[in-house]
Interface confidence: medium
């Protein structure tokens, strides 16, 4: 394994983002800030690629299938957050004039910096980032159903997951920005209706009065769906995510009409300062029945990396977040304030996770400059237990019953220890008889002056293909050292997240 | 209802340590909100000390930084002011006070403490 | 930091009165302005924020209005009850407090 010029695989680190936002099933698509690393390794006439990415996530959806570098900037009026990571990447091209670039496996961490980069310590106007966004699933089924009342095509869509909420607080009120995937449930499979999956982006106002997140003074919905269709049939899908499963590459991504407009839609968005503030949400029922058990169909998606898998994923991809909201909740008393406003503008009985306008505790506790703080060893084994790379805690979609049979593929490999994969409703084990391609660590959020924990690079051995011991793995242990033309340049525009990244690695 | 309750020593001496409990009731401090101390001069001045957040985060008076330290103990339910080396100047009524997020507007109050600083 | 300036530091009315208190900022506080009643016992009550909103159980004879650094708290209709000190407090950036009006009755 020699190390390489960062600018000199730039095309390759390119194509290997496009192809992991294309492999995954949730989250934000990775959009490229700089080749952190890279090292290559040639095997008769195969080009293994060791890369070091350093991603931003942007606001686009994975489900979209967009290339990264064609996501359109966020809605400015609405809050964004900020969330980087770093990905390991191992990718092999089979001959050097071959596009045919594959990538073999992938590890990434990432963390929100919004708090970190917040200066807003003296604002009245208070923006929240929720890590625990599963509490709010009541307010996106809200949201959806509101929704469905003004687009008929959307009758048979169910809350998948809940990716991102943001709250802002103001003298005029509070609002809530609830971004979710949303999955077709058709009663019936076949025929299968065209349109399985969607995104949406609900806005809920409220004002002082309101005791609970029940009854919104305004909401606004706006959501896409993305039609498989558009992706290719991958019911035989090849075990590397390569050319032939290329889900019809970022042009070809569509949504139903154009982008649907009901009646409250952004035409008439929040004005520029928040609305009223108004209560948090109660703990999520988790009250997620919607009618008869559907009957258990095919499923609309294989796994990307398996087509030996007996269920289905749509999921967490190994996206996991560490649970560290610790507050204590046992002291609520069990009071209700009923026709009177509560002078905090608050249900008393709310729960929240943290705030991210100031320096709160983290909850590892301080770490400056240049130590990890989460206790991630920069390379090797990861600390906290396996890696996830047969994900033994995953999703079924809102759509799925969970199968009889409960077994694992393999033991050992669910989420380390003290880390929560996040889930939606209902989730258990999910048998699989083979291994899961990448996974994405979703550590708390960064301090200032912390940097991002390196993902691990404990990859597993594989034989390269076309090879003559196909018995024999042909990966080398993933490189240590920093090649000495990188990292390279951070792509304009990143500027403020780039105190967040390593600059070295350990040689 | 929420309620707050303040105690601790109503006399001080000069350079000594002021130290008081803001016993919470009726809601977790942990939940939401920011839990502030405020205090009243003679005279009726009020003045703003500083706040510990529902996540534990802290926001101080710049006049009062290098003196002051607002802790907290949520399994008690419990927060804490701290005022090193006080002199006759730090004689007031100590409230605590919660707010509906950082410092915009002080919902509750407790009743006040009285702290003379005298030798 | 931010100053508040309330000019009346005391006000004699009849009962019955309409009385306004006002409270001036030393910068726009883009209505983040509140107001609170001291009782004699020393006890504080949070009667109106951001201007002009009215907690929940204060009487409606209490209302706030100001913008930009201009600010006041009418009671429509004086009662006894009433006969207190009255704090203006901006909470756009640090707090600060106003000296405070003692209102009593003629």
């Known amino acids: 394994v020699s190390p390489t010029d960062c600018s000199a695989v730039e095309p390759e680190a390119e194509k290997a983002l496009d192809l992991i936002n294309k492999r995954r099933r949730d989250g934000y698509l990775f959009q490229l800030l700089r080749i952190a690393d890279a090292h290559l390794d040639r095997v008769e006439n195969t080009t293994v690629y060791y890369l070091v990415l350093d991603v931003q996530e942007s606001d686009c959806s994975v489900l979209s299938r967009k290339y990264w570098n064609d996501c359109e900037p966020p809605d400015s009026r609405r809050p964004s957050e900020i969330v980087i990571g770093q990905c390991k990447v191992i990718a092999t091209r089979h001959s050097h004039e071959s596009q045919d670039l594959r990538v073999i496996d992938f590890n990434c961490t990432t963390s929100s910096v919004s708090s970190a980069l917040a200066n807003t310590k003296d604002s009245p106007v208070l923006i929240d980032f929720f890590e625990d966004t599963e509490r709010y699933r009541k307010q996106a089924n809200k949201a959806l159903e509101k929704y469905k009342e003004e687009n008929d095509d959307f009758a048979s869509f169910r809350v998948d997951r809940i990716e991102r909420v943001a709250r802002v607080r103001g003298g005029e009120g509070t609002g809530y920005f609830v971004d979710f995937s949303v999955r077709n449930c058709p009663r019936h499979h076949f025929p299968r209706h065209p349109n399985v999956f969607g995104f949406c982006r609900a806005d809920l106002f409220y004002d002082v009065e309101a005791l609970d997140l029940e009854s919104p003074k305004n909401l606004v919905i706006n959501c896409e769906v993305f039609d498989p269709q558009e992706h290719e049939n991958i019911n035989g899908v090849p075990p590397h995510l390569g050319h032939p499963f290329h889900w019809g590459g970022h042009e070809r991504s569509s949504t139903t009409k154009p982008p649907f407009k009901p009646h409250g839609s952004r035409d008439h968005h929040h004005p520029h300062k928040p609305h009223e503030h108004g209560p948090p949400p109660p703990p999520d029922e988790r009250d997620h029945s919607h009618g008869p058990p559907l009957p258990q169909g095919p499923p609309p998606l294989l796994p990307m990396s398996c087509s030996s898998c007996q269920h289905a994923t749509f999921g967490t991809n190994g996206a996991q977040r560490h649970s560290h909201n610790n507050n204590s909740s046992d002291l609520h008393p069990h009071k209700h304030h009923s026709h009177e406003q509560h002078p905090h503008g608050h249900h008393p009985h709310a729960h929240h996770p943290h705030e991210h306008d100031t320096h709160r505790q983290h909850p590892h506790g301080h770490h400056p400059h240049g130590h990890h703080p989460h206790g991630h060893h920069p390379h090797g084994h990861h600390p906290h237990g396996h890696h996830p790379h047969c994900h033994d805690f995953q999703d079924y979609g809102p759509c799925d019953p969970p199968p009889h049979n409960q077994g694992h593929c393999c033991h050992g490999h669910g989420p380390p220890p003290g880390h929560l994969r996040r889930r939606g409703p209902g989730k258990g084990p999910r048998p699989f008889h083979c291994r899961q391609i990448g996974s994405v660590y979703r550590l708390p959020p960064l301090r200032k002056g912390e940097v991002l924990p390196l993902p691990e690079a404990n990859f597993p051995s594989f034989p390269l293909p076309h090879h003559k011991h196909p018995l024999k793995p042909d990966n080398q242990p993933f490189p240590q050292s920093v090649s000495e033309s990188c990292p390279g340049k951070f792509k304009s525009g990143f500027p403020q997240v780039s105190m967040f990244f390593t600059h070295t690695f350990p040689k | 209802e929420v309620q707050l309750q303040e105690s601790g020593p109503g006399l001080v001496k000069p350079s000594q340590s002021l130290s008081l409990t803001c016993t919470v009731t009726g809601y977790s401090i942990t939940s939401d909100y920011a839990w502030n101390w405020i205090r009243q001069f003679p005279g009726n001045k009020l003045e703003w000390m500083g706040y510990?957040?529902?996540?534990?985060?802290?926001s101080y008076n710049p006049s009062l930084k290098s003196r002051i330290s607002i802790t907290r103990d949520t399994s008690k339910n419990q927060f804490f002011l701290q005022l090193n080396s006080v002199t006759t100047e730090d004689t007031a009524t100590y409230y605590c006070a919660s707010a509906s997020y950082r410092y915009a507007w002080f919902a509750y109050w407790g009743q006040g403490t009285l702290v003379t600083v005298s030798a | 930091d931010i100053q508040m300036t309330q000019t009346t530091s005391s006000l004699s009315a009849s009962l019955g009165d309409r009385v306004t208190i006002s409270c001036r900022a030393s910068q726009d506080i883009s209505n983040y302005l509140n107001w609170y009643q001291q009782k004699p016992d020393g006890t504080v009550k949070l009667l109106i924020y951001y201007t002009s909103r009215l907690l929940s159980g204060v009487p409606s004879r209490f209302s706030g209005s100001g913008s930009g650094t201009d600010y006041s708290l009418t009671i429509s209709n004086l009662e006894q009850e009433d006969i207190a000190t009255y704090f203006c407090q901006q909470g756009n950036t640090l707090p600060t407090f106003g000296g405070g009006t003692k209102l009593e009755i003629k």
């Open positions: 510990i957040s529902y996540s534990g985060s802290t």
